[in-house]
């Protein structure tokens, strides 16, 4: 696993402990919380990042209408169970034996149950809609400039292959970024859209996961883009299974 050799840190994940104990004295980094080795040349999986976060000390209408099956992460933080590859286990349980099924981005997709709850497979989130509202600017952003800047950001900062940024919509002051990645499209080594979206979310919140970086401050043709609000919608390959009681709430 590559890491900055000179001072042995992980450029893509500050929530790690690194030491030169890899093969040939190479720098090796392990995620806090899980102790799993991470590849510092790419993004760390959201599951390992959430686990590390929980272990850390506490300190004309062009816009897309989210589908009726779109999930929003309303449950907040929890200490997840990750598989040996760092992915979310399909079933998550808390210390009081309350269990639920999650999708590949760790968002609950069923009602909560007990230990008898079965989650047969980890359902893939194949479509993510990032909905941003920006603060007033000197003028509306040029759509093509905004599109280019956001695509550049996901390509360069998050190392997400450009083909997975399906669209950038803009209707002042709302910006929507659509990420799409089916199981069949994702090749070995490709960054997962869920991981890229999580890094982006943390950047926007001023909690960058990259080593030695502050929050993400975007500029489009020099114009500061100050984000007022962020909502992220997750669409799974198989619709979620919630009881009617929740759907009508």
């Amino acid at each position: 696993h590559t890491a900055a050799q000179d001072n042995c840190t992980c450029p893509t994940n500050k929530m790690t402990v690194c030491s030169p104990d890899g093969p040939g004295g190479r720098c090796q980094c392990r995620a806090l919380g899980s102790g799993m080795a991470v590849d510092c040349s790419t993004l760390t999986s959201k599951c390992l990042l959430l686990k590390a976060r929980m272990s850390a000390p506490k300190n004309a209408r062009t816009l897309v209408r989210p589908s009726e099956h779109a999930l929003v992460d309303n449950d907040g933080l929890y200490d997840p169970d990750c598989d040996p590859e760092g992915r979310f286990k399909a079933r998550q349980c808390n210390q009081t034996s309350v269990c639920w099924c999650v999708n590949s981005v760790g968002v609950r997709r069923t009602d909560k149950g007990d230990l008898s709850l079965r989650c047969d497979e980890l359902v893939r989130t194949h479509h993510i809609l990032i909905d941003l509202r920006h603060r007033p600017t000197a003028g509306a952003f040029n759509h093509s400039d905004l599109d280019a800047e956001l695509r550049r950001l996901f390509r360069e900062r998050y190392r997400l292959h450009p083909k997975f940024v399906a669209a950038v919509h803009y209707e002042q002051p709302t910006i929507q970024i659509e990420l799409r990645q089916n199981t069949s499209q994702k090749a070995a080594g490709d960054v997962d859209i869920g991981d890229a979206a999580y890094y982006f979310e943390r950047d926007i919140k001023g909690e960058s996961l990259f080593q030695g970086r502050g929050g993400l401050d975007l500029r489009v043709r020099g114009e500061p883009l100050q984000v007022e609000r962020t909502l992220i919608y997750y669409l799974d390959e198989i619709p979620p299974k919630f009881s009617m009681k929740r759907l009508t709430a």
């Epitope: 600017t137 003028g139 001023g206 909690e207 502050g214 929050g215 401050d217 500029r219 043709r221 100050q226």
Partner: antibody, heavy 119, light 106 residues
């Protein structure tokens, strides 16, 4: 290296106008906005507004709207801040500033221009 | 507008002292906080941005911490050249500065 050089001190009478310039060098002028910041003698800093040299767009602090006009001349890599209907409380040092390359904080500052309003 | 309240407004300290200045925002600014140092007759100088990131060339005795609405600038061991006025600034929603903290020689 990045430099912002401002015009010299001005003494003006109440009711007059003043135009302060800020010449940028060492970077592509249209890449970053130019902010203007006011500092009254012995007091704190107050953001006035900015201009985006790329498209001439401006954004102002509500407090200064109406009396302040920020303009630019891209061929001269210069931004201007004009303040009209001057009064004694406009006596201050006015700074231009450029953002940091990866944040919206202000990294490079001009040396400041003292504007004195006195009858 | 977001208000930034800095405290104390002034403090007296000696060379070698540990100095702490706090800044409170009227709402969550999501770590979009910068700290500046200003000496008499000079323009402000950026010390830290993103609440914790040290600007290039700034000595490591300066550090920042905090989140949400509460932020702190710490000078671990005050040096003679550190006697100055310090300002916090938020850049989450336009730009506003704290009223400043003057660090004087005891």
């Amino acid at each position: 290296q990045v430099q912002l050089v401002q015009s010299g001190a001005e003494v003006k009478k109440p009711g007059a106008s003043v135009k302060v310039s800020c010449k940028a060098s060492g970077y592509t002028f249209t890449t970053y906005v130019i902010h203007w910041v006011k500092q009254k003698p012995g007091q704190g800093l107050e953001w006035i507004g900015y201009i985006n040299p790329n498209n001439d767009g401006t954004k102002y602090n509500e407090k200064f709207k109406g009396r302040v006009t920020i303009t630019r001349d891209t061929s001269a890599s210069t931004a201007y801040m004009e303040l009209s209907s001057l009064r004694s409380e406009d006596t201050a040092v006015y700074y231009c500033a450029r953002p940091h390359f990866e944040t919206h904080a202000m990294d490079y500052w001009g040396q400041g221009t003292l504007v004195t309003v006195s009858s | 507008d977001i208000q930034m309240t800095q405290s104390p407004s002034s403090l007296s300290a000696s060379v070698g002292d540990r100095v702490t200045i706090t800044c409170k925002a009227s709402e969550d600014i999501f770590n979009r906080l910068a700290w500046y140092q200003q000496k008499p007759g000079k323009a402000p100088k950026l010390l830290l941005y993103g609440a914790t990131s040290l600007e290039t060339g700034v000595p490591s005795r300066f550090s920042g911490s905090g989140s949400g609405t509460d932020y702190t600038l710490t000078i671990s061991s005050l040096q003679p050249e550190d006697f100055a006025t310090y300002y916090c600034q938020q850049y989450w929603n336009t730009w506003t500065f704290g009223q400043g903290t003057k660090v004087e020689i005891k």
